[in-house]
Every structure is written in structure tokens, then in C-alpha cells.
């Protein structure tokens, strides 16, 4: 039975992931029985990615490490639509590390997953980035401009946003 063997395969795959994420929320994408995409519970999903808001306050390096042990990275924001989705889950009085840094302090910003940094798809607050010693990026809320990015010192503990590709089963 085709459906039965598919289900057995799926269950064995789900068991593989349980040591990292005990619970996954899966949806059938499109009409093809092949395409089930999953995010860990209680991560949120948007397009082909899963997102997790980490409320623990850590440095940028520790925040990236925290994401990586879950199979994720600090968030890479590729579009305005993606940012609009992310901010729905953020608190206005908090700041969150992004997967964006300038390790050399020469304004060569780079994303953690090597996505090319595109000046045309950035959402810096006005006047930012403004300090060569502030080499890590956060997203925060300013009443005058709503949500945007700011450069800060990497060692200053912040909340963070993790992003991973959906898990396909």
C-alpha cells in the first residue's frame, strides 16, 4: 500500500529529528502527497523557513551558537515581507540580534549564511549604522520609524531570532 509505506517512512524520519526537536508541526504543501514541511513546535513558519524568538539575553556569538545547536542560524532577512512577518512576534521594548555582522569594523556587513549583503534590501534606522566599533546588528522599535536595524557592540547581551530551513519529510 503506497500510502502506508509513505507514512512509515515519514514516522521514521520524524524519529530522527526527535533528539533535537521533540515536537514538529507539519503541513502538506500543495497537492502533492510528497510535500510535507515541518517546523519545530512552537517555532513559526513563513515561506520555506522556520523562526524562533530566543528571549534569553546573550552576546551575538553566544546567540549564534544557541541557534546552531538547534540546527538554525541567527536570522537572515531577505525581503521586506519576511521582516514584516518577523516583527509580528517581537516585543517593542526589546532588541533582537540578527545574523548580520561587520567583523572587521570596515563596514563590510555580512550575513551568517553567506547571503550577499544587498544595500538595496536593508532596513537600517535613519542614521544607522553609525559606529565602526559597533559590529553586530539588531532589530528594534523606534516610535518615530517603527521597526528597523541598528548597529551595536557584539558583546552586549540581547534577545535574538533564529531561522532554519523547514524540515521536509
Amino acid at each position: 500500500n503506497f500510502m502506508y509505506s509513505k507514512t512509515v517512512k515519514r514516522l521514521s524520519k520524524l524519529r530522527e529529528y526527535q533528539q533535537y526537536h521533540p515536537s514538529l508541526t507539519c503541513v502538506m504543501e500543495g497537492k502533492d502527497i510528497e510535500d510535507w514541511s515541518c517546523c519545530p513546535t512552537p517555532w513559526t513558519s513563513f515561506q520555506s523557513s522556520c523562526y524562533f524568538i530566543s528571549t534569553g539575553m546573550q552576546s551575538w556569538t553566544k546567540s549564534q551558537k544557541n541557534c546552531s545547536v538547534m540546527g538554525a542560524d541567527l536570522v537572515v532577512i531577505n525581503t521586506r515581507e519576511e521582516q514584516d512577518f518577523i516583527i509580528q512576534n517581537l516585543k517593542r521594548n526589546s532588541s533582537y540580534f540578527l545574523g548580520l555582522s561587520d567583523p572587521g569594523g570596515r563596514r563590510h556587513w555580512q550575513w551568517v549564511d553567506q547571503t550577499p549583503y544587498n544595500e538595496n534590501v536593508t532596513f537600517w534606522h535613519s542614521g544607522e549604522p553609525n559606529n565602526l566599533d559597533e559590529r553586530c546588528a539588531i532589530i528594534n522599535f523606534r516610535s518615530s520609524e517603527e521597526w528597523g536595524w541598528n548597529d551595536i557592540h557584539c558583546h552586549v547581551p540581547q534577545k535574538s531570532i533564529c531561522k532554519m530551513k523547514k524540515i521536509y519529510i
Partner: nanobody, 123 residues
Framework: QVQLQESGGGLVQPGDSLRLSCTAS????????MAWFRQAPGKERDVLAT????????FYAESVKGRFTISRDNTKNTVYLQMNSLEPEDTAVYYC????????????????WGQGTQVTVSS
């Protein structure tokens, strides 16, 4: 079941370069962290390099740091090991391996293995 197939091994001279490839049958390749290991005759299987699902995080063993580079192309379901400045001590069978979500340096933590490809460095 993830099936892995290595290619690119062979006989080279000291100082030469080789690029190994490992292609996965699994269409859900991006679910997996990948690694390269090697095993010389009578020795343990040693980790050389690991790479995260997105390719953002890599690890290298001290013995190959600066000479070997791991990378992956998720559109081709393939992971690569670029090996430069090869030495006779690099002679071994090279294996790629896959595990769900998070890389590890311990071979016991990998669920899926290729058959291996022989690399011989000799003048």
C-alpha cells in the same frame, strides 16, 4: 533512506590538489548536516570537516585546517571537500556522512554513510 555517493578520489603527487564530491539521493538534503571523514589502514575513522545545513558553520580538524575546505551546494544535493597541498599522510579512504539538523565531530553520531573513495598521495 539517504544514499550518499562519493567521487573524485585517485592517485596524486605530494603538493597536488583534489576535489571530492558527495551526492545525496535524498531530495530533503537540506535537512542534514554533512561531514567528511577518512580512514587509513589500521586506523580509526577521523573527522576532517563538518558543515551545517545552510553552510554557515564549518569545523576543521587541526590536521587539515588551512589546506582543506568543505562546502555544499543545496541546489545540487552535493557536499564538496577541496583538498590542497596534499601529503603522503593524507592517503586514506575518504567518506562523507549525513546526520539530521546538527553537525557533530563524532562518527558514531552519523546515521548515513557513503561507500568511500580512495585517495593515494605518492611520488
Amino acid at each position: 533512506q539517504v544514499q550518499l555517493q562519493e567521487s573524485g578520489g585517485g592517485l596524486v603527487q605530494p603538493g597536488d590538489s583534489l576535489r571530492l564530491s558527495c551526492t545525496a539521493s535524498e531530495r530533503t538534503f537540506t535537512n542534514y548536516a554533512m561531514a567528511w571523514f577518512r580512514q587509513a589502514p589500521g586506523k580509526e575513522r577521523d573527522v576532517l570537516a563538518t558543515i551545517s545545513r545552510s553552510g554557515s558553520s564549518t569545523f576543521y580538524a587541526e590536521s587539515v585546517k588551512g589546506r582543506f575546505t568543505i562546502s555544499r551546494d543545496n541546489t545540487k544535493n552535493t557536499v564538496y571537500l577541496q583538498m590542497n597541498s596534499l601529503e603522503p599522510e593524507d592517503t586514506a579512504v575518504y567518506y562523507c556522512a549525513a546526520r539530521p539538523l546538527v553537525p557533530s565531530e563524532d562518527p558514531d553520531n552519523y546515521n548515513y554513510w557513503g561507500q568511500g573513495t580512495q585517495v593515494t598521495v605518492s611520488s
